[in-house]
Amino acid sequence: DFGLDCDEHSTESRCCRYPLTVDFEAFGWDWIIAPKRYKANYCSGECEFVFLQKYPHTHLVHQANPRGSAGPCCTPTKMSPINMLYFNGKEQIIYGKIPAMVVDRCGCS
Amino acid sequence: DFGLDCDEHSTESRCCRYPLTVDFEAFGWDWIIAPKRYKANYCSGECEFVFLQKYPHTHLVHQANPRGSAGPCCTPTKMSPINMLYFNGKEQIIYGKIPAMVVDRCGCS
């Protein structure tokens, strides 16, 4: 498995992982105690046929070409968690590992 | 986690799982000995904001709205393997569990 990494200067048009810092403070999400911001990353770009396809299934659906199938799109194929400290609905402070908060790899699926 | 299930008669426009039988014989993929066909399913439909979002990350990227982020798309969020019997490149018969061949659930990511 591999995926492309890009930045704001890249001319890559294909599916790629781009850096993105999520700033909870800027969103006004003040129930999040820590971190106030973190590197989340995001996926963007075109999915030409077969390029960076995560699953054989994607190729098979392309072959079968059913009505309404839009073709693969650039989406996270590997994600990782971050540890967070936040208030829950009962105003208790919670420390927990929140899954799928960081995009590690992008692909076409 | 849940996802919508549709069929060819559905009027649902949102992200949904549709039935699809993949026929290896029709593709001419004769290196696959068995199965000759299987129920693969596929994802299709629109991803309105927050509908069927698999990850909090999807919501955060929408909030941050970076250049080039296309918004979530309807993609498999749960997949399962099938057992297959096939010839490898060395013309040996292989029995194996092939991952991510069946879409069990669709969502927006």
Epitope: - | F24, G28, W31, I93, Y95
Partner: antibody, heavy 124, light 107 residues
């Protein structure tokens, strides 16, 4: 419908060779193993071997390995079984049969269709 | 090679009878056993596969059972068209081997 049609009866002299054909129709010929089975007059069935037409991979019964060759012509969807150095005890009806997989395990199959048989008589 | 011993080698029965044919393998064949019917001058016809599964289109009066090394074919109510020779086949390993056959005759 799926059908296997074999070539006509043959009379051969000892030491000669015979090539029996089996023409398939009604399915994708290249994607199914073809087996050959023979039956001597008044006797039981004996497996000779098989071939996968897509790539020509074959597997022979050790008893016949030195004398048998199985081939296919995918352009005409025909399987062939050639037996060399014929002896009188090779007199038999030769059948082709298609192997159909109902599952994905190595042995998850059965013979779903048979050819009508070809009588080969070896006599001086 | 796996030896398949079929018994009896011949059997006389009447229309309406229930008959059982057995097949014994020289080693465990993991239920990879098929049964065939053959009529004079005709190709064999598959009846049962994987020891107990009925081939599509075969009447339910035919049934198979067994596991390990011992297997049986049962015909619940014999009809005139059922008088034929029956063979078992093991497909657990190569070479494939058949039983020697059971000739079912009208009494």
């Amino acid at each position: 419908q799926v059908q296997l049609v074999q070539s006509g009866a043959e009379v051969k002299k000892p030491g000669a060779s015979v090539k029996v054909s089996c023409k398939a129709s009604g399915y994708s010929f290249t994607g199914y193993f073809m087996h050959w089975v023979r039956q001597a007059p008044g006797q039981g069935l004996e497996w000779m071997g098989n071939i996968y037409p897509y790539n020509g991979v074959s597997n022979y019964n050790q008893r016949f390995k030195a004398r048998v060759t199985m081939t296919t012509d995918t352009s005409t969807s025909t399987a062939y079984m050639e037996l060399r150095s014929l002896r009188s005890d090779d007199t038999a009806v030769y059948y082709c049969a298609r192997r159909y997989y109902y599952g994905t395990g190595f042995a998850d199959w059965y013979f779903d269709v048979w050819g009508q048989g070809t009588l080969v008589t070896v006599s001086s | 090679d796996i030896q398949m011993t079929q018994s009896p080698s011949s059997l006389s029965a009447s229309v309406g009878d229930r008959v059982t044919i057995t097949c014994k393998a020289s080693q465990d064949i993991n239920s990879y056993l098929s049964w065939f019917q053959q009529k004079p001058g005709k190709a064999p016809k598959s009846l049962i596969y994987r020891a107990n599964r009925l081939v599509d289109g075969v009447p339910s009066k035919f049934s198979g059972s067994g596991s390990g090394t011992d297997y049986t074919l049962t015909i619940s109510s014999l009809q005139p068209e059922d008088f034929a020779t029956y063979y078992c086949l093991q497909s657990d390993e190569f070479p494939l081997t058949f039983g020697q056959g059971t000739k079912l005759e009208i009494k």
